[in-house]
Interface confidence: low
Amino acid sequence: KKVVLGKKGDTVELTCTASQKKSIQFHWKNSNQIKILGNQGSFLTKGPSKLNDRADSRRSLWDQGNFPLIIKNLKIEDSDTYICEVEDQKEEVQLLVFGLTANSDTHLLQGQSLTLTLESPPGSSPSVQCRSPRGKNIQGGKTLSVSQLELQDSGTWTCTVLQNQKKVEFKIDIVVLAFQKASSIVYKKEGEQVEFSFPLAFTVEKLTGSGELWWQAERASSSKSWITFDLKNKEVSVKRVTQDPKLQMGKKLPLHLTLPQALPQYAGSGNLTLALEAKTGKLHQEVNLVVMRATQLQKNLTCEVWGPTSPKLMLSLKLENKEAKVSKREKAVWVLNPEAGMWQCLLSDSGQVLLESNIKVLPTWSTPVQP
């Protein structure tokens, strides 16, 4: 008996071939001997089966002795043995219809679990193997679970169902709802405008939800909500904003926040959360702000940074075009009695300059002592 695998919702074509290459009488029946369809001369006739409106044949092939049964919009319950009767012979074809669905929405938050459920006909014992967009293979029986979805899991999952040495392939598009970056860091000189961007790693037609940016300033004992906003069909509207600092927010995606000026008291780290409508859980992106200030007070030239810097970052003070006068893995460096000229304060990581602030030191003229 020939075995054919079909996919729920698809169309399948079961073949039946006569030895004579001409149009002769045929009919298709199911295992209960109920007629599905056949012919009467050049006309297609249909029987009383439940497939009635979904069954068809290809009349253009009849003259070649081919009498296929086409079943559209397959259902799991269409799984059956189909019999083609032609020229006093019977051809049996076993059709097994499988369905593979994500047990929840195919739009899932980063960190959530994906469960794929296989619908199969009674008596079948299929095995399933799925390959994620990043090439990870998972195997299972009636259900497959992937916990802790990552951004790289977004895309087309290809799942192969094996039964009776035959296979059928399913493709499921999964969208992992996440920000493009889990964390970002912005380096700014004191007084500069700060732009925070929170691009999403997915696109959907309608996006509705609400969000909030909590900020933990390095100097503050507790975190503070800087801004809350709503998202309606990709339009952003601010609900509440602190008076200090006064953030501005773009009205369109990607989410974009502007801090009028970087000040030491704002240096720290923030967590932007986005709760999407009809989704449990929230999207998160961490953002960090490092602020640099170079100052000269009397005979002391100081460079300081505030905010979350890694211990391997180097802070240096150097006269332009000269070797660094002082270079430390600390958050403040200074030079006493600096020479006149343009001094540079540099924050660097393995030789790569992350932030630079210039300060001009003027010559000091000694006042002559009066006799």
Epitope: Q193, V238, K246, P260
Partner: antibody, heavy 120, light 105 residues
Framework: IQLQQSGPELVKPGASVKMSCKAS????????INWVKQRTGQGLEWIGE????????YYNENLKDKATLTADKSSNTAYMQLSSLTSEDSAVYFC??????????????WGQGTLVTVSA | SPASLAVSLGQRATISCKAS??????????MNWYQQKSGQPPKLLIY???NLESGIPARFSGSGSGTDFTLNIHPVEEEDAATYYC?????????FGGGTELEIK
């Protein structure tokens, strides 16, 4: 901080008009420019706003097919074009900017207004 | 309300504004008040229900929360003859009240 608007306009029904709002005294790209309509002897109606920094705009649903907002960063000027004018569009149009800190959600700075008269 | 109001010089003028829904959020009321004189643009008087804008005389004060707000002017002066508008800024699009015309007797 000043917002200087262009002069009065007399236009025919069906035509279009483009008015300007030149900002000075602050960093133009840091603040949103809003536009507000006031028909003679009537109240105020918010039309929309534009972010000069990014060029992104946002409109009152009732008026979004009427107005088009643009901004030119090089000249610190915001523009509003009104199309398919009818007598209903005869009004004074103000540009306005919100404040800073506490008054950041109120219109603290206003242009002097541009009078548009639609008449055959 | 009211649409117009006549108050004697030196007396108190009270103008009310009722929002169709609450304009409060997290302890703040997003209601602003403006004064507009003929041929001039509106001028911000009060922001966030009760905060006096810089440069505005202390005889102007605002109060209220939720849906009911009041602008008080006391004592009224000649130069206060104008139309006064309330405006909510909690929800886009922001909307203005119909205005109250104040006449000084």
């Amino acid at each position: 901080i000043q917002l200087q608007q262009s002069g009065p306009e007399l236009v025919k029904p069906g035509a279009s008009v483009k008015m300007s709002c030149k900002a000075s005294g602050y960093t133009f790209t840091d603040y949103v420019i809003n536009w507000v309509k006031q028909r003679t002897g009537q109240g105020l109606e918010w039309i929309g706003e534009i972010y000069p920094g990014s060029g992104s705009d946002y409109y009152n649903e009732n008026l979004k097919d009427k107005a088009t907002l643009t901004a030119d960063k090089s000249s610190n000027t915001a523009y509003m074009q009104l199309s398919s004018l009818t007598s209903e569009d005869s009004a004074v149009y103000f540009c306005a900017r919100k404040g800073e800190n506490g008054n950041s959600l109120a219109f603290a700075y206003w242009g002097q207004g541009t009078l548009v008269t639609v008449s055959a | 309300s009211p649409a117009s109001l006549a108050v004697s010089l030196g007396q108190r003028a009270t103008i009310s504004c009722k929002a169709s829904q609450s304009v409060d959020y997290d302890g703040d009321s997003y209601m602003n008040w403006y004064q507009q004189k003929s041929g001039q643009p509106p001028k911000l008087l009060i922001y966030a229900a009760s905060n006096l804008e810089s440069g505005i005389p202390a005889r102007f004060s605002g109060s209220g929360s939720g849906t009911d707000f009041t602008l008080n002017i006391h004592p009224v002066e000649e130069e206060d003859a104008a139309t006064y508008y309330c405006q909510q800024s909690i929800q886009d699009p922001c909307t203005f009240g119909g205005g109250t015309e104040l006449e000084i007797k």
